[in-house]
Amino acid sequence: DSEEDEEHTIITDTELPPLKLMHSFCAFKADDGPCKAIMKRFFFNIFTRQCEEFIYGGCEGNQNRFESLEECKKMCTRDNANRIIKTTLQQEKPDFCFLEEDPGICRGYITRYFYNNQTKQCERFKYGGCLGNMNNFETLEECKNICEDGPNGFQVDNYGTQLNAVNNSLTPQSTKVPSLFEFHGPSWCLTPADRGLCRANENRFYYNSVIGKCRPFKYSGCGGNENNFTSKQECLRACKKGFIQRISKGGLIKTKRKRKKQRVKIAYEEIFVKNM
């Protein structure tokens, strides 16, 4: 089917945020199963970070399959910005501050911080590099700013303002937006190339975060980590700028991206995860 559709995409001058999902099945590849029915279903695409349509065969498959776009969005996406702004202005912590620390299903372990609701403090844990949840911060300071109570009953919100616990008045502080909104690529893009454990010599690409470029490497065929792409284009899309077009003045623009409708089984680059 060569029918094409045009898709409007919001483009920002910043990189994509880390991928943090509530459910690990949202990372599964779309699976039409072995049967031959033609059923319209929806799945969450970890590369575009959107719920998209696919054709389901009617049997087997996996949990990344939803009857409606709304159900898919409900299970696999979060309106993070709105949720944070809303809860902060109500002088509450964002709800994700109360989630248990979640290392995710990958194994490129890196230091992150989470808010421990029992101790009421931000603490260190080891994050596997993909999925997990939003109670996951790159710095102790960012975690404290978003989830910890400030001194004297003040709660610091995410736009550099303090909420006065007594009369709810807003006191301007720093105008710096915290790094939750300083979008950057998926955290697995920071992991080193990992050949894996097998003996094949497959041509793959990984994102070198030091030089900011995608570079080739030889993949053994199994294991490794998610910083592993079958093409340079896919590597750049996931780790460099995605569908991002740099614009000198920053801000938002709309661009058009043409994409063929897919009527066959979706085949992504392999994503290497720990066995569930």
């Epitope: 248990e100 290392p103 372990y109 890196i110 230091t111 911080y113 029992q118 260190r124 844990f125 790159e138």
Partner: antibody, heavy 118, light 112 residues
Framework: EVQLVESGGGLVKPGGSLRLSCAAS????????MSWVRQAPGKGLEWVST????????YYADSVEGRFTISRDNAKNSLYLQMNSLRAEDTAVYYC???????????WGQGTLVTVSS | DVVMTQTPLSLPVTLGQPASISCKSS???????????LNWLQQRPGQSPKRLIY???KLDSGVPDRFTGSGSGTDFTLKISRVEAEDVGVYYC?????????FGQGTKVEIK
Amino acid sequence: EVQLVESGGGLVKPGGSLRLSCAASGFTFSSYAMSWVRQAPGKGLEWVSTITTGGSYTYYADSVEGRFTISRDNAKNSLYLQMNSLRAEDTAVYYCARQDGNFLMDYWGQGTLVTVSS
Amino acid sequence: DVVMTQTPLSLPVTLGQPASISCKSSQSLLDLDGKTYLNWLQQRPGQSPKRLIYLVSKLDSGVPDRFTGSGSGTDFTLKISRVEAEDVGVYYCWQGTHFPFTFGQGTKVEIK
């Protein structure tokens, strides 16, 4: 005073199973990630597994992944290690340890000896 | 995995004299957050391990100040300014920067 008391060790044949327990007291158990570390006779220490505060998520050493399962019951202030398909090389004293806010082990139990032998 | 190498493996010392144990890691222990998660444990004969020092140089509560930790990157040192009888045992360095956590082979401190 923080106290961690392990139990459940003993002699088991290769391929057998054993379940270790660690009873915690003197601190709010549910506030801390917990770990198991082992020490083979006359040898050094080896990290085995860690579990998050609420018990939903786990980490394992490659040497035990797929064979050992760490779990916890916060209501009972208890940590567990279910060990299946045991091998001679799993023979060791097993310690439970608490993880502090830096994700570092700060308090250790007295250990329980697991011997895998035919 | 990060390999931790301690020297010496055996350290006979005279009571009241200083002692020094070296610990080297196969890669830097400086984490992305700017902290270095290098720690020292003491295991007295027949006892379980006890944490002495964390984050290179911070002493745990109740640890005598004759113990000091220092170092950065890949090279670290534990010093005992004046060895006492109760200091006899095995000392382990271990790193909590990279996963999995790994330990040194241990240094046995004994009285001459």
